[in-house]
């Protein structure tokens, strides 16, 4: 077969080929940020000629053109400046309202490098309607000026802009517009991962039992807690495997889907996952009718077995057939469970379509969506039972109109996105499901995204301080109880002067709480073994603080999971009937277990907990410590099996002020406290006033650093005695 010519360079940009210079290969151009390729792609035809999708004239030279953002077509009840035909990247547009109107949205907006405006649509509103003025997004024209109950407004985009969102919206009885805000965008524009992750995550979290704390009060009356803990979600993942998706991109589709599956199973809901790959025909790798669809490892293994070559005989993009296979699956499940049963009617359905381009065979995918809506009886009352996310990847030949048509339209949410490349998709899936937005006391959730603050990453972390200097750290284990070290309280027992500083989204300094009562382990006595040459002994170094008020759960304040509790059992996705021993086996399951603690400056530091036969070699070093233990005859009297041991190799050592803080590990995107920082042989912060300065011990130091942490699995009787009414403990 002939190959296509190689004179296809783009000035100022680069290109990639999906299958070399052979027929069927897709050439994709890319340009530096702030520029876009024209054309975006070319396809090598069997004749050995390049064809530009959608082009009418012969091959034109590929160039990188400057990205521009659309101009306002009209702005009601106010003025905007400057008035340009379109705006360059970095350019601003400002809005002001006439007297009697209040500006809602962003007064100044900036054109971003992806051709999208930052901020929110500016609206000048006088609050006269039943619904708020829905505004006119930049580049759009609106017809309809009445905002009473039942009134409709329609939108279209000027010139060659593409509309995403709802072209028609209706003012509903609850004072909220139906559908989702329309946005007019350049055909070459795309979404940044950092915008998509929260938008997608917010919508998804609604389904997973979350409320969106950023929503306005009036709007938040809309879609609140959807899947209760007992509810069921069917998640259908549709992965495009057509010719224009390279094998490498398909691998990233798979990896992103795996991330999604991993995250979704970390929620405490019942979920079944279907996996469908498609090109000219769909291939069902996992059906929701299969019991294995409820098992994360089975679902991920079926994803891993998805093979790019499965579709090499038919390489078109038949999105209709893919969605239709979802419809057929639903139909079978409905027949199985019975159309009228609650078991069927209470299942919520989410479809995630990962594609790189428009469907080019099999008819309109919209028809399949209509069938799905029909079988699920989706109406205004049951709108929350179906969410379709259409995610286009690669700016090349993605059809905005089609994606927009397929994606659900829900107020304050977006369901259709285009990302620049598969790398961006991976980023989105890594960060989209931010469980930390949940408002109930779900435990062990930290925001793992790159731009999260330290407190958002470890929202259980608290500082315990007397009137003056900071002394200790601790961990929220419920909305009113903090777990910490007993030795923090050995100087005087008047806790009325003490404060506990808890994370607060409204303040970078957190929020201070008084202590209602302190429960200090009666077994703790630092001088208990003085006559054995042990000047300080830290057995039973554990305490509980009850705060004077309950902490409001937020992204910055949330309890960590305590092992051996029902709450942790749910987070570990373990079966009912699991025991404390099962938890210990799952969490402390290696001779060297990677774990973390939180530093004085709030950052998360790494340690390795030595278990089994390695514990003894870790702990024995203490016999070399002659200052703390001058006449020590039996090291076993200092380091009892109440302690976890770390500090070997590259471990960080906790500083003095970090005592009481949680020693925790991550499993299934959730965090579990297995210990609390108690004592050590080396203080890396000694002699430094700077919170950010830690000194590693010299390699020749005798004894080498070692750190000991109270092992919560060894403190179960005491924890159960005092927290029996607060947490639900499992049998030992």
């Amino acid at each position: 077969a002939p190959s296509c010519p190689q004179n296809v360079n783009i000035s100022g940009g680069t290109f990639t080929l999906s299958h070399g210079w052979a027929p069927g290969s897709l050439l994709t151009y890319s340009c530096p940020q702030g520029l876009y390729p024209s054309p975006a792609s070319r396809l090598c035809k069997s004749s050995g000629q390049w064809q530009t999708p959608g082009a009418t004239r012969s091959l034109s030279k590929a160039v990188c053109k400057p990205v521009r953002c659309p101009a306002p077509v009209s702005f009601e009840n106010g003025i905007y400046t400057p008035r340009l035909g379109s705006y360059p990247v970095g350019g601003n547009v400002s809005f002001e309202c006439e007297d009697g109107f209040i500006l809602r949205g962003s007064p100044v907006r900036q054109c971003r490098p992806n051709g999208m405006w930052d901020g929110e649509t500016a609206v000048c509103d006088n609050g006269a309607g039943h619904c708020p003025n829905p505004g006119i997004s930049l580049g759009a024209v609106r017809t309809g000026f009445r905002f009473g109950h039942g009134d409709k407004v329609r939108y279209r985009c000027s010139s060659n802009l593409v509309l995403t969102g709802s072209s028609e919206r209706e003012c509903q009885g609850n004072g909220v517009w139906s559908g989702t805000e329309p946005i007019c965008r350049q055909p070459y524009s795309y979404d940044f991962p950092e915008d998509v992750a929260p938008a997608l995550g917010t919508s998804f979290s609604h389904m997973l039992g979350a409320t969106n704390p950023t929503q306005k009060t009036k709007e938040s009356l809309g879609r609140k807690i959807q899947i209760q803990r007992s509810g069921h979600l069917n998640l259908y993942l549709l992965l495009d495997c057509s010719q224009s998706v390279s094998e490498n991109d398909f691998l990233i589709f798979k990896e992103s889907a795996s991330l999604m599956v991993d995250r979704i199973f970390s929620f405490e809901i019942n979920v079944s996952v279907a996996i469908i790959t498609f090109a000219s025909e769909p291939k069902v790798l996992m059906s929701v009718l299969n019991d294995n669809s409820r098992d994360m490892t089975e679902v991920i293994s079926s994803l891993e077995n998805a093979n790019y070559k499965d579709h090499e005989n038919g390489t078109g993009t038949n999105t209709y057939a893919a969605l239709n296979s979802v419809y057929l699956m639903m139909n079978n499940q409905m027949r199985l469970l019975g159309m009228e049963t609650m078991a069927w009617q209470e299942i919520r359905h989410a479809i995630i379509l990962l594609t790189d381009g428009k469907s080019n065979m099999g008819g309109s995918p919209k028809t399949a969506v209509d069938h799905i809506r029909e079988i699920l009886n989706i109406n205004q009352k049951r709108n929350d039972y179906l969410d379709i996310y259409a995610i286009g990847v690669g700016k090349l030949d993605v059809d905005w109109r089609e994606l927009n048509e397929l994606g659900s339209k829900k107020d304050g949410e977006r369901h259709a996105f285009i990302l620049q490349d598969t790398k961006a998709l991976h980023q989105v899936f890594e960060h989209m499901l931010d469980v930390s937005k949940l408002t109930d006391t779900i435990c062990g959730v930290g925001n793992m995204s790159a731009n999260a603050s330290d407190q958002e990453r470890t929202p259980w972390h608290v500082t315990i301080k007397p009137k003056s200097q900071e002394t200790c750290r601790g961990a929220l284990i419920s909305d009113q109880w903090v777990l910490t070290a007993a030795h923090c309280f050995r100087d005087g027992n008047d806790h009325s002067l003490w404060r506990v500083n808890v994370g607060d989204p409204k303040s970078q300094w957190g929020k201070e709480f008084l202590i209602e009562k302190a429960v200090i382990s009666p077994g703790f006595d630092v001088f208990a073994k003085k006559n054995q040459g042990i000047l300080e002994f830290y057995g039973d170094d554990i305490a509980l603080l009850k705060l004077a008020q309950k902490v409001k759960m937020s992204t910055h304040a949330r309890p960590i999971c305590l092992p051996c509790t029902m709450e942790a059992n749910l987070a570990l996705r373990r079966p009912q009937g699991s025991t404390c021993r099962d938890h210990e086996n799952e969490l402390l399951n290696k001779q060297s277990v990677p774990a973390h603690f939180v530093a004085l400056n709030g950052s998360k530091l790494n340690i390795n907990l030595k278990m089994g036969v390695e514990w003894t070699s870790c702990a024995e070093v203490v016999s070399q410590e002659k200052t703390m233990f001058p006449n020590l005859t039996d090291v076993r009297e200092v380091v009892t099996d109440q302690f976890l041991c770390s500090g070997t190799q590259e471990d960080e050592s906790p500083c003095k002020g970090e005592s009481g803080g949680a020693v925790f590990l991550e499993r299934r995107f959730r965090f579990f406290q297995v210990g609390l920082v108690s004592w050590g042989l080396y203080n890396p912060c000694l002699g430094s006033a700077d919170k950010n300065s830690r000194k590693r011990a010299p390699r020749s130091k005798v004894p080498p650093p070692r750190d000991f942490h109270i092992n919560l699995f060894r403190m179960q009787p005491w924890l159960r005695q005092h927290l029996g009414d607060v947490l639900n403990f499992l049998p030992l």
Epitope: N585, N589, G612
Partner: antibody
Framework: QLQLQESGPGLVKTSETLSLTCTVS??????????WGWIRQPPGKGLEWIGS???????YNNPSLKSRVTIFIDTSKNQFSLKLSSVTAADTAVYYC??????????????WGQGTLVTVSS | SSELTQDPAVSVALGQTVRITCQGD??????ASWYQQKPGQAPVLVGY???NRPSGIPDRFSGSTSGNAASLTITGSQAEDEADYYC???????????FGGGTKLTVL
């Protein structure tokens, strides 16, 4: 409740290799930090530790048995096995498999199989 | 040397207290564990660590350590306590395990 069951031939010829397998049920061989061990007891005598294996792959063997001992683990079958080469009549014993725990400063076997008698004959 | 020494036989009157001892250098470094074995049966763990008892073991069994010696004490011996008792610990190097020779307890 964890259960261990030894299996393998009850009779082995001198100089051949004794092979036994221990099947673990009621728990996963890879969960937690356990040392899956073999202990033997010649008729009318005391207990002798043969060796142990950790699911991470580390093995610990009795130096008196030198290089005759091989212990390996099959996580897919939830089993661990013992091979003792070049056996003699002195290797006749009841062979037990057990779950070993190293906790703090102590090491103990908390679950045992019921034992299987292996006789070495010429 | 890496060995544990036990008295071969000990007897006790029914209802009385008996101490079974185990000696060895490794006991300065590691705690002993104790097993009860009845004829034709597999050993059963009855004590370990400084003074720990597995669940299901009666509280008349207790352990202690002093220097290079460990002991298992049975307070108020019962007829069913008649059995062989073995001590076990890691050896002095910490790399291997050793068993004592066993003590035959007779309840009179």
């Amino acid at each position: 409740q964890l259960q261990l069951q030894e299996s393998g031939p009850g009779l082995v010829k001198t100089s051949e290799t004794l092979s036994l397998t221990c099947t673990v049920s009621g728990g996963s061989i890879t969960s937690g930090v356990y040392y899956w061990g073999w202990i033997r007891q010649p008729p009318g005598k005391g207990l002798e530790w043969i060796g142990s294996i950790y699911h991470g792959g580390n093995t610990y063997n009795n130096p008196s048995l030198k290089s005759r001992v091989t212990i390996f683990i099959d996580t897919s079958k939830n089993q661990f096995s013992l091979k003792l080469s070049s056996v003699t009549a002195a290797d006749t014993a009841v062979y037990y498999c057990a779950e070993g725990v190293s906790s703090g400063w102590s090491y103990y076997f908390d679950y045992w199989g019921q034992g299987t008698l292996v006789t070495v004959s010429s | 040397s890496s060995e544990l020494t036990q008295d071969p036989a000990v007897s006790v009157a029914l209802g009385q207290t008996v101490r079974i001892t185990c000696q060895g250098d490794s006991l300065r470094r590691f705690y002993a564990s104790w097993y009860q074995q009845k004829p034709g049966q597999a050993p059963v763990l009855v004590g370990y660590g400084k003074n720990n008892r597995p669940s299901g073991i009666p509280d008349r069994f207790s352990g202690s350590t002093s220097g290079n010696a460990a002991s298992l004490t049975i307070t108020g011996s019962q007829a069913e306590d008649e059995a062989d008792y073995y001590c076990n610990s890691r050896d002095s190097s910490g790399d291997h395990l050793i068993f004592g020779g066993g003590t035959k307890l007779t309840v009179l």
